[in-house]
């Protein structure tokens, strides 16, 4: 007989079952491809000198054998003489130590006895009505299966579940979804409607994140504003890592939590784009503007809860950097230009009012003028900074205004709007005798003093009404009192006070007349 064929002769050993406890068992025969079949079995007992024979009887009653030698697995084709279409009975006889040991018989139709595989390849995971849905392509030629799953969490043992019968080219399973812990799933299959068939191996692990991604527990710090008008946002604390079940540790595709940083620039609302989303690993540079920063955690099921922080505006001011000239046509601001073709955002708001009331204007991209300055002008009719009050002005610059993280702060300063020279005039000027030749002049603070850095100084003017001589006395902007000395008794004087800014001379207050009485000695 040819080794590839089932030999229809008597086997080369006596036909007698020893009935010993050892011997062949657990015979399984499967179709392994279109035209090939395989039988395998276990052998219990010493294996030295054992020869195995796979026996087969057809429905006609004719029997044959394959000699397997010492192997416990044997493959044959559909042309080997064994009927694959009709029912056959198979068993193993093992010849050892001058005795024959027989396995239990199996009766089957080989063509329909497929060794079922677990789900292979890509298992798609999705969420369906609060449950987990897994879907995969049915392994080739294995349509019609029972499917089971098992699952565990980092702290719980395996639990078994049933996916129910499957009968299509794609199979699926609904499984429980945990709210807050990751799970590991494995699947196995067996032939549908064939209770005696054995289960496949378990599939490779399918790692599934919790329904809710973990809330990011992070902290930020923001550095000082640099010379370039930018400050770095840094992460003080990394997000906690998700605890994974045993089979998902190491490489666990599917359980990844991604953390994204969402920046919302609150200042300069007239710019084109106010929000930008970045990967958490890529910490951005920010201007000195106010921002809201949210960290959003998400996994394959979508975003989770986010955590939001407010980064206040950098309020460091540079009072000298901004030059403002007021003319009949309107007002023009000048400041040192940043670079060629820069877009500037000028933002202003009345001091002491809610940040939500800021107004802003976006310039067209501009190059520096011959003096290296950038400018912004507005007419009186526009009403911009038209009220006589203190405004906080911030100027931002960007070569790419559509990119939120490329804005920088040029300067922040204060400006008194409207007719500052008149509005700043000190009131309630009063004169008190101080000594025989001096008086104390004091006044209510100018409105300009409410605007940090705007009031440069007070000037007190004293005029001798007899000689028409005038003296002027500069006074620090923080003072509202001065002593005038060297005065003569009996002479009429007038005193006036004005408040000056760096670029504007104030208007004198109403003249205040006084004189020092002549002292008559007894």
């Amino acid at each position: 007989c040819r080794t590839s064929e089932c030999c229809f002769q008597d086997p080369p050993y006596p036909d007698a079952d020893s009935g010993s406890a050892s011997g062949p068992r657990d015979l399984r025969c499967y179709r392994i491809s279109s035209d090939r079949y395989e039988c395998s079995w276990q052998y219990e007992g010493p294996t030295a000198g054992v020869s195995h024979f796979l026996r087969c009887c057809l429905s006609s009653g004719r029997c044959c054998y394959f000699a397997a030698g010492s192997a416990t697995r044997l493959q044959f084709s559909d042309q080997a003489g064994v009927s694959v279409l009709y029912t056959v009975t198979l068993w193993v006889e093992s010849w050892a130590r001058n005795q024959t040991e027989k396995s239990p018989e199996v009766t089957l139709q080989l063509y329909n006895s497929v060794k079922y595989e677990p789900p292979l390849g890509d298992i798609k995971v999705s969420k369906l009505a609060g449950q987990l849905r897994m879907e995969w392509e049915t392994p080739d030629n294995q349509v019609g299966a029972e499917v089971q799953f098992r699952h565990r969490t980092p702290s719980s043992p395996w639990k078994l579940g049933d996916c129910g019968p499957q009968d299509d080219d794609t199979e699926s399973c609904l499984c429980p979804l945990e709210m807050n812990v990751a799970q590991e799933f494995q699947l196995r299959r067996r032939q549908l409607g064939s209770q005696g068939s054995s289960w496949s191996k378990w599939s490779s692990p399918v790692c599934v994140p919790p329904e809710n991604p973990p809330q990011p527990q992070v902290r930020f710090s923001v550095e000082q504003l640099g010379q370039d008008g930018r400050r770095r946002l840094t992460l003080k604390e990394q997000p906690t890592q998700l605890e994974l079940p045993e089979g998902c540790q190491g490489l666990a595709p599917g359980t990844e939590v991604t953390y994204r940083l969402q920046l919302h620039m609150l200042s300069c609302p007239c710019k084109a784009k106010a929000t930008r989303t970045l990967h958490l690993g890529k910490m951005p540079y920010l201007s000195g503007a106010a921002y809201n920063v949210a960290v959003i955690s998400s996994n394959q099921f979508g975003p989770g809860l986010n955590q939001t922080w407010h980064i206040p505006a950098d309020t460091h001011t540079e009072p000298v950097a901004l030059n403002i000239s007021v003319g009949t046509n309107g007002t023009t601001m000048y400041w040192p230009a940043r670079a060629q073709s820069m877009t500037y955002c000028i933002e202003w708001q009345p001091v002491g009012q809610d940040g939500g009331l800021a107004t802003c204007s976006l310039t067209a991209p501009q190059d520096p003028d011959p003096a290296g300055m950038a400018t912004y002008s507005w007419s009186r009719e526009s009403g911009a900074m038209g009220q006589e009050k203190c405004y906080y002005i911030t100027i931002f610059a960007s070569a790419h205004p559509e990119k939120l993280t490329l804005w920088s702060t040029v300067l922040s300063t204060y400006h008194f709007g409207g007719n500052a020279s008149a509005a700043g005039t000190p009131h309630h000027v009063s004169v008190k005798n101080h000594s025989l030749d001096s008086v104390s002049v004091d006044w209510a603070p100018s409105l300009l003093s409410t605007c940090p850095g705007v009031l440069k100084e007070y000037v007190v003017r004293c005029r001798d009404e007899d000689s028409k001589q005038v003296s002027e006395h500069p006074v620090q902007p923080t003072e509202t009192q001065v002593t005038l000395s060297g005065l003569r008794a009996g002479v009429a004087y007038t005193v006036q006070v004005r408040a000056d800014t760096a670029w504007l001379r104030g208007v004198w207050s109403q003249p205040q007349r006084f004189s020092i009485e002549v002292q008559v000695s007894d």
């Epitope: 491809s33 035209d35 559909d78 063509y111 030629n141 349509v143 019609g144 009968d167 299509d168």
Partner: nanobody, 121 residues
Framework: EVQLVESGGGLVTAGGSLRLSCAAS????????MGWFRQAPGKEREFVAV???????DYADSVKGRFIIFRDNAKNTLYLQMNGLKPDDTAVYYC???????????????WGQGTQVTVSS
């Protein structure tokens, strides 16, 4: 999407021949066993022939020796060569993909729309 499309049916006189084709798509044709069934008016669908793997075949007793089932895996096509046709062979012929016991309708999961064969005496 799995599709099976039969063709080649028609009207033939008794004793004549026809070759039916079944073009398969949407699955790996070569790894599936395939079968032909037929359904005459007012009768149940009945097994005609099966090909298991690439060469093992079986037939209903009524067609043995007259019909031949074969396949061309390169073309994803199943054939039924019908010789010595009789009026009793008049029916709609269906090809199907086997997933279970080959002689029963329940042993197949995907079916074509059928092709009409009419044998006149």
């Amino acid at each position: 999407e799995v599709q099976l499309v039969e063709s080649g049916g028609g009207l033939v006189t008794a004793g004549g021949s026809l070759r039916l084709s079944c073009a398969a798509s949407g699955f790996r044709f070569s790894v599936y066993d395939m079968g032909w069934f037929r359904q005459a008016p007012g009768k149940e669908r009945e097994f005609v022939a099966v090909i298991v793997g690439s060469r093992t075949t079986d037939y209903a007793d009524s067609v043995k020796g007259r019909f031949i089932i074969f396949r061309d895996n390169a073309k994803n096509t199943l054939y039924l060569q019908m010789n010595g046709l009789k009026p009793d062979d008049t029916a709609v012929y269906y090809c199907a993909r086997r997933v279970g016991t080959y002689e029963t309708v329940l042993g197949y999961d995907k079916w074509g729309q059928g092709t009409q064969v009419t044998v006149s005496s």
